[in-house]
Interface confidence: medium
């Protein structure tokens, strides 16, 4: 048995409500992107900004599919492409193994009801490995930088939260019971958990780079929309079979 | 629901033109290939014509190249078939069909998953 | 005459299980292009019944399974009931014709 993609009809759960009839959801993609030869990379696209349904995502590069993932059908990947694409994580791809004739560029095509089609483009630029390398040098100091800032920032956040929580909490003890349930159910499908084979019913990790372009409140909508997908996607959503 | 509702088949002469309509509801038209399929009476299925999504791409039956012209206009949420120069060998009923995806290369992987209810064309003096 | 070839006819008896064949070549169904099987019951339209080679929609029932292997595909039917006598078509598309094909059809009867 094979389960919906809960994440495709989640995508719009968290959007407000906004004029129908005209096209206002935007693609955020991991835009320019470079990997090493024979490394693997996840392609990821998001969708927001829009109430519509999503019904299906493809994959394609220049003019070749790659991968579909359809809300009652489920993942398909391209038989040319299966040895070295995996679905996910969430609507985006795994490539692997990658070679240099994999630089160029990739699409994700979001199919919606009623807006229709929108497309992310991002450019992938294989790297021969010692040049890939080269460019690591220069990347690592950053990202331990960014990573530092982060884990300082996070602390400080979490020590605020803490207290403050720690306060509320000598005063509502129900509440806390309550919260303490709704965490117990987010566990059972947080963005790390497995879905079930072949599904594409996982949570969508925020693609790379998403967070520092974005305002903070919307990162914190991202955040908040994978808490609700987290336990709501404990509901029935089996609408697929498949044969083997 | 997804639904599709073909109209304009009816009794036309040989040599005459007849335009079918196939008007789309419940789904992102704009989203999807679509094909016309016939079936003539006691025969089986016959492909004749698909468009890509967007229109850019159409594609015929041989037996139909030439004479038949598939059109969309998304705007509408309709597909039409354009029928010209019409024989005998025409009569059946027509199909419209979706096909499981869009997108913008992949139409001929994915078969069609809907089908309207039909309309029927006949083509005799 | 049609580019996939099927039986004309088959027919089973209530909980048997009937196979129906369907052979093409090298630029359809030996391709990598998928074979999709619709059911075309009496007097309606066709319905899709099996995509992607091998797999169901939803709502359609576990006794219906499919397969391919080289340039031939064949739908099996297995405790076969008397609903499900109809006919059967395997449909690809065919990169020599740039066309979509389908099989002549095949009437399942149900005795």
């Known amino acids: 048995m094979r389960w919906c993609l809960l994440l495709i009809w989640a995508q719009g759960l968290r959007q407000a409500p906004l004029a129908s009839g005209m096209m206002t959801g935007t693609i955020e993609t991991t835009g320019n992107i470079s990997a090493e030869k024979g490394g693997s990379i996840i392609l990821q696209c998001h969708l927001s900004s829009t109430t519509a349904q999503v019904t299906q995502v493809n994959w394609e590069q220049q003019d070749q599919l790659l991968a579909i993932c359809n809300a009652d059908l489920g993942w398909h990947i391209s038989p040319s492409f299966k040895d070295r694409v995996a679905p996910g994580p969430g609507l985006g791809l795994t490539l692997q193994s990658l070679t240099v004739n994999d630089t160029g560029e990739y699409f994700c095509i979001y199919h919606t009801y009623p807006d229709g089609t929108y497309t992310g483009r991002i450019f992938l630029e294989v790297l021969e490995s010692s040049v890939a390398e080269h460019g690591a040098r220069f990347q690592i100091p950053l990202l331990g930088a960014m990573a530092a800032t982060l884990v300082v920032i996070c602390t400080a956040v979490i020590v605020v939260v803490a207290l403050t929580r720690k306060k509320k909490a000598l005063r509502i003890h129900s509440v806390e019971g309550d919260l303490r349930r709704k965490s117990a159910g987010q566990e059972e499908w947080s963005p790390s958990a497995p879905s079930p084979p072949g599904s594409c019913v996982q949570a969508e990790a925020a693609p790379a780079g998403l967070c520092g372009e974005q305002r903070g409140e919307d990162c914190a909508e991202l955040h908040d929309y994978f808490n609700v997908l987290s336990y709501r996607s404990l509901g029935n959503c089996s609408f697929f079979t498949e044969t083997g | 629901e997804v639904q599709l509702l073909e109209s304009g088949g009816g009794l036309v002469q040989p040599g005459g033109s007849l335009r079918l309509s196939c008007a789309a509801s419940?789904?992102?038209?704009?989203?999807?290939?679509m094909s016309w399929v016939r079936q003539a009476p006691g025969k089986g299925l016959e492909w004749v014509a698909g468009?890509?999504?967007?229109?850019?791409?159409?594609y015929y039956a041989d037996s139909v190249k030439g004479r038949l012209t598939i059109s969309r206009d998304n705007s509408k949420n309709t597909l039409y078939l354009q029928m010209n120069n019409l024989r005998a060998e025409d009569t059946a009923i027509y199909y419209c069909?979706?096909?499981?995806?869009?997108?913008?290369?992949?139409?001929?992987?994915?078969?069609?998953?809907?089908w309207g209810q039909g309309t029927t064309v006949t083509v005799s003096s | 005459q049609s580019v996939l070839t099927q039986p004309p006819s088959a027919s089973g008896t209530p909980g048997q299980r009937v196979t129906i064949s369907c052979s093409g070549s090298?630029?359809?169904?030996?391709?990598?292009?998928?074979v999709h099987w619709y059911q075309q019951l009496p007097g309606t339209a066709p319905k899709l019944l099996i995509y992607?080679?091998?797999q169901r929609p939803s709502g359609v029932p576990d006794r219906f399974s499919a397969s391919k292997s080289g340039t031939s595909a064949s739908l099996a039917i297995s405790g076969l009931q008397s609903e499900d006598e109809a006919d059967y078509y395997c449909?690809?598309?065919?990169?020599?014709?740039?066309?979509?094909?389908f099989g002549g059809g095949t009437k399942l009867t149900v005795l």
């Open positions: 449909a690809t598309w065919d990169d020599s014709l740039s066309a979509w094909v």
């Open positions: 069909a979706k096909h499981l995806t869009g997108g913008t290369t992949d139409y001929y992987y994915y078969g069609m998953d809907v």
């Open positions: 992607f080679d091998s």
């Open positions: 419940g789904f992102t038209f704009t989203s999807y290939a």
């Open positions: 468009i890509s999504y967007i229109g850019r791409n159409e």
């Open positions: 090298t630029s359809n169904i030996g391709t990598s292009r998928y």
